[in-house]
Every structure is written in C-alpha cells, then in structure tokens.
Amino acid sequence: QKPSIGKCSVDIQQNRTKTTERPDLLNCPIYWQQVQEKCLLFSHTVNPWNNSLADCSTKESSLLLIQDKDELTRTQNLIHDKAISFWIGLNFSLSEKNWKWINGSFLSSNDLKITGDAKENSCVYISQTSVYSEYCSTEMKWICQKELTLVRNKVSPDSWL
Amino acid sequence: QKPSIGKCSVDIQQNRTKTTERPDLLNCPIYWQQVQEKCLLFSHTVNPWNNSLADCSTKESSLLLIQDKDELTRTQNLIHDKAISFWIGLNFSLSEKNWKWINGSFLSSNDLKITGDAKENSCVYISQTSVYSEYCSTEMKWICQKELTLVRNKVSPDSWL
C-alpha cells in the first residue's frame, strides 16, 4: 500500500530576487510526501535501476540517498506492504570494489547490512525490514527525493552576452 | 506543480577526513578532458536527450551546464567537425514556458540565441558554431560534465549503527 500524498510545507522562507534562481520550495509536489527535510516520491510503477535514476532526474530529483540508520528506519516505516521493494541511489562500483551512492560517496563500513551479492550490475533496494542487492536490470519500484533545503543554483546562466 | 530543488555544488573547500566522502578530484577520469574547472566527456555514440541525461547520471555527472558565453565558445572550440552535434542539459519546460537547465534554473534573457522551436519536447544541442533546439527523441551525441571544484558531500552515509 502507498503512503498518503497530502501536501507538505517547510518553515523557512527566504527573499529571492534573481529570476534565474529556483523559486522557494514551500511544499512538496502532488504525489510526494514530506519526511523531515525531504520530499519523497514512492513510485507505483516499476523500472530497472537505471531508468529509475533517469526518472528521478527528469523530475529534478535524485534516487533516495540515506543519511543514517534513523532515516532508513523512517523510510521503511512508510512501506506498508512486506512484499514491496524500492530501488535507492546505491549501487556497486566494480572499478572501486565498493558500494557507492549516486552522489559519489562510498559505504565505508559494514554497519549497513546489504543482503545479496556485491558484484558488477548489483543495485540496492529496500523493503519494509531489510536492505538487499539485486541485478540492476530487475524492474522494481523506486524512491525519488527532493531536499527541502533552500539552495542557490550555482549554474543559472543569465549573462549571455 | 511545485518547483523542485536539485542540489548544487559549493565553492568553499573544506578539510576532508571521512573515508565515505568523495576523494578529491585531482584529474579527470580516462576518456574525459579538462576544460578549466570541469571534466568533459564527449560521447561517441548517440542517444535521445533523456537517455543522454541518464547516461551522465550513471557516470555521476550531469549533462553539460554552460555558465556563460565564454564557456560556450570554449566548448564549441573542442568540436572539430561541423557536422557533429551534442545534447546539453537544457530543454523546454512547457509548464513554465521557458528554457530550463537541468539544475532547475532558467534562461532569463534572449541573449543566448537558440535556433529552432521553443515548444514541448524541445531539447538543446550545440554544434561547432551554433545552439539549436530539436525534438528530444532525436538521437545525438552528448556532453557530460563533472565539476573539478572540491565539494564536501552532504549525504555520505558512514554511521549505520
């Protein structure tokens, strides 16, 4: 079953003047839900990991990045069906022989217990209770995230001379 | 729909101690070339724009974002064949009726001359001399970028308890 999709809000607002900067994100888009300082989208349909990554990108978001065990638990608590699995933004880097988040950081310890093989074309998904690896070509649901922190875009071309 | 909030990199360098953070990018990966503070990868194969976006994501990079006209010129100088075109990270947002970079910022002026239609499913590519729009489903080469600035990863899970 899916979590609710009510709108959510963020407390901090800032004055924004440049038109090229992104408007403040004052609430989560429809279909998304606020979980602390993130908006999360739990997909209903399924995709291979790479397509899930692309889908989040087209939504100007990222496959889920998990900060710590608390966030993992909070996210898993939103999964209401034991049989449902969701891709997250973690896969195995063959060249570096390590699990790697899509932001480039690595899992440096074994405190996150990933059940399954650590090998080429292995991607990570979460269920209600566990964290698993599976062939990245497998079709699964996925979770996109948008961070609610208000950030200034570094690249906002407004000076084409 | 609400705006989204893709993260961007920061200019300030910080001391790096945690092993889960991304190693300093001191030189460009193999096949990539350094252009000022970026590493660029000019694809050899072709893809629709969306697949190009996904490919850059899987390389932990972005479709090219162009800061100013100087950077456009520098990039075009690296294209040695007049007949070759490359997707960049700019497409038309129908809902916002504006050209939008994949980091969420907009083209706020008409100083960038895009030849072609500004309509749904229009994406932007560059050639040796010009900037064009074309149906996003068209297969073209593309350019990925990695920024050489040293940034601290916000999400680097290293405390799985």
């Epitope: 079953q1 899916k2 979590p3 609710s4 999709i5 009510g6 429809i30 279909y31 989208l41 997909s43 209903h44 349909t45 399924v46 995709n47 291979p48 397509n51 692309a54 889908d55 087209t58 939504k59 079709e139 996925w142 996109c144 | 629709p48 969306n50 749904e120 499913n121 996003c136 489903s137």
Partner: antibody, heavy 121, light 107 residues
Framework: EVQLLESGGGLVQPGGSLRLSCAAS????????MSWVRQAPGKGLEWVSA????????YYADSVKGRFTISRDNSKNTLYLQMNSLRAEDTAVYYC??????????????WGRGTLVTVSS | DIQLTQSPSSVSASVGDRVTITCRAS??????LAWYQQKPGKAPKFLIY???ALQSGVPSRFSGSGSGTDFTLTISSLQPEDFATYYC?????????FGGGTKVEIK
C-alpha cells in the same frame, strides 16, 4: 501533437484473435507505463492491462488473464494488445491510456480515440 | 480488488445548478482518486487527480474533495457542456478500478 491512436479493431468470431496497436506521439513514450482500458457498449470503464515503461512487467484484469498479452516497442513508440480466445463479453471499445506521471500506473491524462472490437458469430 | 461505488447513478439538473457526485471506496485509498468526464462516443477526459488536484485546462467550477474512503466531485455551476457521464477511479493499487459512473442529464 501529443496523441495516442489505436488501430486493429474489427469483427471477429468467438475463439478468434486480434492484435490492437496504439501509436504514441508528442511525448517520451519510453518513460511511461501504459494501459489498455475498455468500455462495453452502454457500460462503464474497465481497466484491462498495464505494462511498465521498460516493458518487463505486465499486469492483467482477471477477466482477460491468460488470453490477452500486452507488449510495447519503445523504438516504435507503440503499445500492443494481443487478444486470443475472444469471447462475446470482450466486445467493447478499447482505449490505450497514458498516466499523468511517469511514476504512476493510473491517473490517465491522455487517451486514444478508441478502437471497436466486436466478437460475434 | 478495491471497489468504487458512485452515487447517484444519474442526476437531472439545470444549467447553473450545483451538482455533487460521491464515490465511496471499499477500503482506505488515502488521496489516490481521480475523476473523469465522458461524453457519448468520446474518450474519457481527465479532470481531477489526487482527490482534489485540478488537471491543467479544466475549468475551476470543477472541484474534488475527500480522503480515505469518501470522495466528492462538485460542479459549482453546471454549464451546457458539462452534461456527460462522470467516473471515479482509484490509483492506489492494481488492478486499477473505476466507479460505475454517474450520468448528469438535462432536467
């Protein structure tokens, strides 16, 4: 122009087969799960089948399971419905439908005009 | 499967009337409900999703409300072009299911 265009309907005898096609244009077809929905004459809407964006996952209504097969060719921007062992109760207008959001199965913001399938001897 | 029950099955109304159609789900579907309008011989038209979000281009006289199991579609001031059949649809789980429809007729 953003559109879906079904074809392949017609008159078929009970036990016969038909293959419906739905040609998509004006949007990134390969990003979206797609569905077939049907409507018997004078009746309401009935969801028939869905397929994931990449085509590897399919679902069917119990009423057509084992007889119908949904497929897609993303290189041709086309959705298909192969209908075998057709019955009189399969007589309906068949619509293909696209969801509003690429993460969803439903919330169909784009429908084709429909193609009529008549099963009769 | 989730059953959706619409009421009334038909309603007679005049131009300018306020019309309310209800849809009841057999189990909690949160806000995963959409509404469609269909005219004879035409494909359905998407009106509302996520229970209350108005699809782009749909007139503001249409509104949706509700959550959980009980939902409402309201047409605040009926226009001649609004005479049609209206369907609710749940988007929570497969199989996707539709309500039986409500026909809005001219009084």
């Amino acid at each position: 122009e953003v559109q879906l265009l079904e074809s392949g309907g017609g008159l078929v005898q009970p036990g016969g087969s038909l293959r419906l096609s739905c040609a998509a244009s004006g949007f990134t077809f390969e990003r979206y799960a797609m569905s077939w929905v049907r409507q018997a004459p004078g009746k309401g809407l009935e969801w028939v089948s869905a397929i994931s964006a990449a085509g590897g996952t399919t679902y069917y209504a119990d009423s057509v399971k084992g007889r119908f097969t949904i497929s897609r060719d993303n290189s041709k921007n086309t959705l298909y419905l192969q209908m075998n062992s057709l019955r009189a109760e399969d007589t309906a207008v068949y619509y293909c439908a696209k969801p509003l959001d690429s993460s969803q199965w439903a919330d169909f913001d784009l429908w084709g005009r429909g193609t009529l399938v008549t099963v009769s001897s | 499967d989730i059953q959706l029950t619409q009421s009334p099955s038909s309603v007679s109304a005049s131009v300018g009337d306020r019309v309310t159609i209800t849809c009841r789900a057999s189990q909690d579907i949160s806000s995963w409900l959409a509404w469609y309008q269909q005219k004879p011989g035409k494909a359905p038209k998407f009106l509302i999703y996520a229970a209350s979000a108005l699809q782009s281009g749909v007139p503001s006289r249409f509104s949706g409300s509700g959550s959980g199991t009980d939902f409402t579609l309201t047409i605040s001031s009926l226009q001649p072009e609004d005479f049609a059949t209206y369907y609710c649809q749940q988007a929570l789980v497969l199989p996707i299911t539709f309500g039986g429809g409500t026909k809005v007729e001219i009084k």
